[in-house]
């Protein structure tokens, strides 16, 4: 049978930026860094100043979803983390401004942010069973679980 793709008609409206300039560390104490113009990867850094700093923007769902829906932007840029398919790298998409409304295929820009203690998970809104993940010797990607690492610690500067 032909593959079936369901695109929800839920609309997500931008509310505000809720976190600025934070770092994502995975469970192996690796930080997310820029691999190139398009991809991210993870490495245990000698100097954390080399890690990517992210901003997090919150969106409100027309469905009144209880989940926190967010967009991830590299701080001081116009680059946004964008989901592809399972085991595919997340991409950095350049946009002139943060989208005020997101729906349909554009939901690949959005993630459900869940926290369990100090562990943070980012599930793709477009692919609700897949998480932002790190994988050994690979880009930051979308994955369903092990062997990829799907839990992150958010490091906010405590200066």
């Amino acid at each position: 049978s032909a593959p079936f793709s369901f695109l929800s008609n839920v609309k997500y409206n931008f509310m505000r930026i809720i976190k600025y300039e934070f770092i994502l560390n995975d469970a192996l104490n690796q930080s997310i860094i820029r691999a190139n113009d398009q991809y991210l990867t993870a490495a245990a850094l000698h100097n954390l100043d080399e890690a990517v700093k992210f901003d997090m923007g919150a969106y409100k769902s027309s469905k009144d979803d209880a989940k926190i829906t967010v967009i991830l932007r590299i701080s001081k840029t116009q680059l946004y983390v964008t989901a592809q398919d399972e085991d595919q790298p997340v991409l950095l998409k350049e946009m002139p401004e943060i989208p005020k409304t997101i729906t349909g295929s554009e939901t690949n820009l959005l993630f459900f942010w869940e926290t369990h203690g100090t562990k943070n998970y980012f599930t793709s809104v477009a692919h609700p069973n897949l998480f932002i993940a790190t994988k050994q010797d690979y880009w930051v990607c979308l994955a369903g679980g092990p062997p990829s690492i799907t839990d992150f610690q958010i490091l906010e500067n405590q200066a």
Epitope: N25, N47, L48, D49, Q153, N157
Partner: nanobody
Framework: EVQLLESGGGLVQPGGSLRLSCAAS????????MVWVRQAPGKGLEWVSS????????YYADSVKGRFTISRDNSKNTLYLQMNSLRAEDTAVYYC?????????????????WGQGTLVTVSS
């Protein structure tokens, strides 16, 4: 040869302050995260705080957050820990260390170099 030399420990009353220093040599100081760890009498090593190579990012254990401040002067190759509102449970030998890799040492951290430590005793 890499060397880390801590100083500034001593006896202080509860609520008091101390400033620890760590003089580093033998490596390019500003290219590395640095951390403070401590070992209380009869206990294991506890991570206290980390600072990035350029000093742009700092992070603290919950037990010291709001009371301790980590900083560094890369022109002097020196790491600092300002300790305020000291409590009896802060009594420990404090070590500065250079992590082998990574930043937050609460779960995953190994050190390639650390100092000989400086004793901080908080008691009335």
């Amino acid at each position: 040869e890499v060397q880390l030399l801590e100083s500034g420990g001593g006896l202080v009353q509860p609520g008091g302050s101390l400033r620890l220093s760590c003089a580093a040599s033998g490596f390019t100081f500003n290219e590395y995260n640095m951390v403070w760890v401590r070992q209380a009498p009869g206990k294991g090593l506890e991570w206290v705080s980390s600072i990035s190579g350029g000093g742009g990012f700092t992070y603290y254990a919950d037990s010291v957050k709001g009371r301790f401040t980590i900083s560094r002067d890369n022109s002097k190759n020196t790491l600092y820990l300002q300790m305020n509102s000291l409590r009896a449970e802060d009594t420990a030998v404090y070590y500065c260390a250079k992590p082998l890799r990574g930043f937050v040492c609460s779960q995953h951290c190994s050190f390639d170099y650390w100092g000989q430590g400086t004793l901080v005793t908080v008691s009335s």
